[in-house]
């Protein structure tokens, strides 16, 4: 009865277990009773990343600059090229096939997490006591100015888009004139 299974680094062919080709190599010919599996290294710009019986290597990914892509890690005979996006852009998918511009956080919102090559900017609304008056991909919400520490008083209340306006203390409140 011929074998129906093989060990992990082998494959079944013609009722025989033949050695798989190592990563970085492709299958040229199957083994026989007396000859080993014949494998050949992948060519330039090609790869195979697993023990395999592939007769053709895979082409390295092309990082198309027209799509905002650049090479993050050059491929080898055992690994594919890894693409990432140009500065200010991020990948639209995990496979990073194209890029889009990082979003900016509108006034009233601050940057919670700065964008990376693979993730967009994460914005958050400025809570009470904080503001953002710009549209930015980097700026966090800033705390309102503390008038008291400058020996000033609040003349105009702050909002999520504007800072408080401080002014001098009203002297009349502090100096009572007696007639």
């Amino acid at each position: 009865e011929p074998p129906t299974a093989c060990r992990e680094k082998q494959y079944l062919i013609n009722s025989q277990c033949c050695s798989l080709c190592q990563p970085g190599q492709k299958l040229v010919s199957d083994c026989t009773e007396f000859t080993e599996t014949e494998c050949l290294p992948c060519g330039e710009s090609e790869f195979l990343d697993t023990w395999n019986r592939e007769t053709h290597c895979h082409q390295h990914k092309y990082c198309d600059p027209n799509l905002g892509l650049r090479v993050q890690q050059k491929g080898t005979s055992e690994t594919d090229t890894i693409c990432t996006c140009e500065e200010g852009w991020h990948c639209t998918s995990e496979a990073c096939e194209s890029c889009v511009l990082h979003r900016s956080c509108s006034p009233g919102f601050g940057v919670k997490q700065i964008a990376t090559g693979v993730s967009d900017t994460i914005c958050e609304p400025c809570p009470v006591g904080f503001f953002s008056n710009v549209s930015s991909a980097f700026e966090k919400c800033h705390p309102w100015t503390s008038c008291e520490t400058k020996d000033l008083v609040v003349q105009q209340a702050g909002t999520n888009k504007t800072d408080v306006v401080c002014g001098p203390q009203d002297r009349l409140r502090h100096h009572h004139h007696h007639h």
Partner: antibody, heavy 127, light 107 residues
Framework: EVQLLESGGGLVRPGGSLRLSCAAS????????MDWVRQAPGKGLEWVSY????????DYADSVKPRFTVSRDNSKNLLYLQMNSLRAEDTAVYYC????????????????????WGQGTMVTVSS | DIQLTQSPSSLTASVGDRVTITCRSS??????LAWYQQKPGKPPKLLIY???SLEGGVPSRFSGSGSGTDFTLTISSLQPEDFATYYC?????????FGQGTKLEIK
């Protein structure tokens, strides 16, 4: 230290069942293929069964099909051999062994061998 | 199934002797053969894999050769600790099989 330790052997009546265990330590058990090999008193080695690292693939010697079942629990670093419908001719020392794939990237083809063995557990089938 | 036949079944030799054990396969197995040493009451110990590659920590007096159907294990100069039983095993395909063993005894 890389170690395999079998347990679960003993005396059992013909037709009975037994479950052998093999506890692995000192290596990443879930990355290795494993085997059971037995040796009847005063006799040679006989391969019994094989299991892949994930447990997905198994194979058996004709002499134990379909009575024996090999399985593994990678979360517990344990290999098992469930033995049913035992016969007198199953009497032997049962060893678990680690299958290793030796590979030198400069060479064309790798090779398998069983590089780590347990001390064995004795199974006696007798009435 | 692939049958492995070892010869001789037993062998008597002296310390310092050169000893050769052969293993013949019923069909071609390329170089998918391993050799083991076993001492009484102990588990087998891997000596050679892939027909000719020496396992780490095994003394260089042990060597393996052959491919296809005919294989040999050679001990260039026997040491007292080498007296044991030797087995060949094919890992070419399932079911894996062992030779019947060669018992090496002291003269």
């Amino acid at each position: 230290e890389v170690q395999l330790l079998e347990s679960g052997g003993g005396l059992v009546r013909p037709g009975g069942s037994l479950r052998l265990s093999c506890a692995a330590s000192g290596f990443t058990f879930g990355s290795y293929e494993m085997d059971w090999v037995r040796q009847a008193p005063g006799k040679g080695l006989e391969w019994v069964s094989y299991i892949s690292s994930s447990g997905e693939t198994t194979d058996y010697a004709d002499s134990v099909k379909p009575r024996f079942t090999v399985s593994r629990d990678n979360s517990k670093n344990l290999l098992y051999l469930q033995m049913n419908s035992l016969r007198a001719e199953d009497t032997a020392v049962y060893y678990c062994a680690r299958d290793v794939f030796f590979f030198d990237s400069s060479g064309d083809n790798g090779a398998y061998g069983m590089d780590v063995w347990g001390q064995g557990t004795m199974v006696t089938v007798s009435s | 199934d692939i049958q492995l036949t070892q010869s001789p079944s037993s062998l008597t030799a002296s310390v310092g002797d050169r000893v050769t054990i052969t293993c013949r396969s019923s069909q071609g197995i390329r170089s998918s053969l391993a050799w083991y040493q076993q001492k009484p009451g102990k588990p087998p110990k891997l000596l050679i894999y892939g027909g000719s590659s020496l396992e780490g920590g095994v003394p260089s007096r042990f060597s393996g050769s052959g491919s296809g159907t005919d294989f040999t294990l050679t001990i260039s100069s026997l040491q007292p600790e080498d007296f044991a039983t030797y087995y060949c095993q094919q890992l070419n395909s399932f079911p894996s099989t062992f030779g019947q063993g060669t018992k090496l005894e002291i003269k």
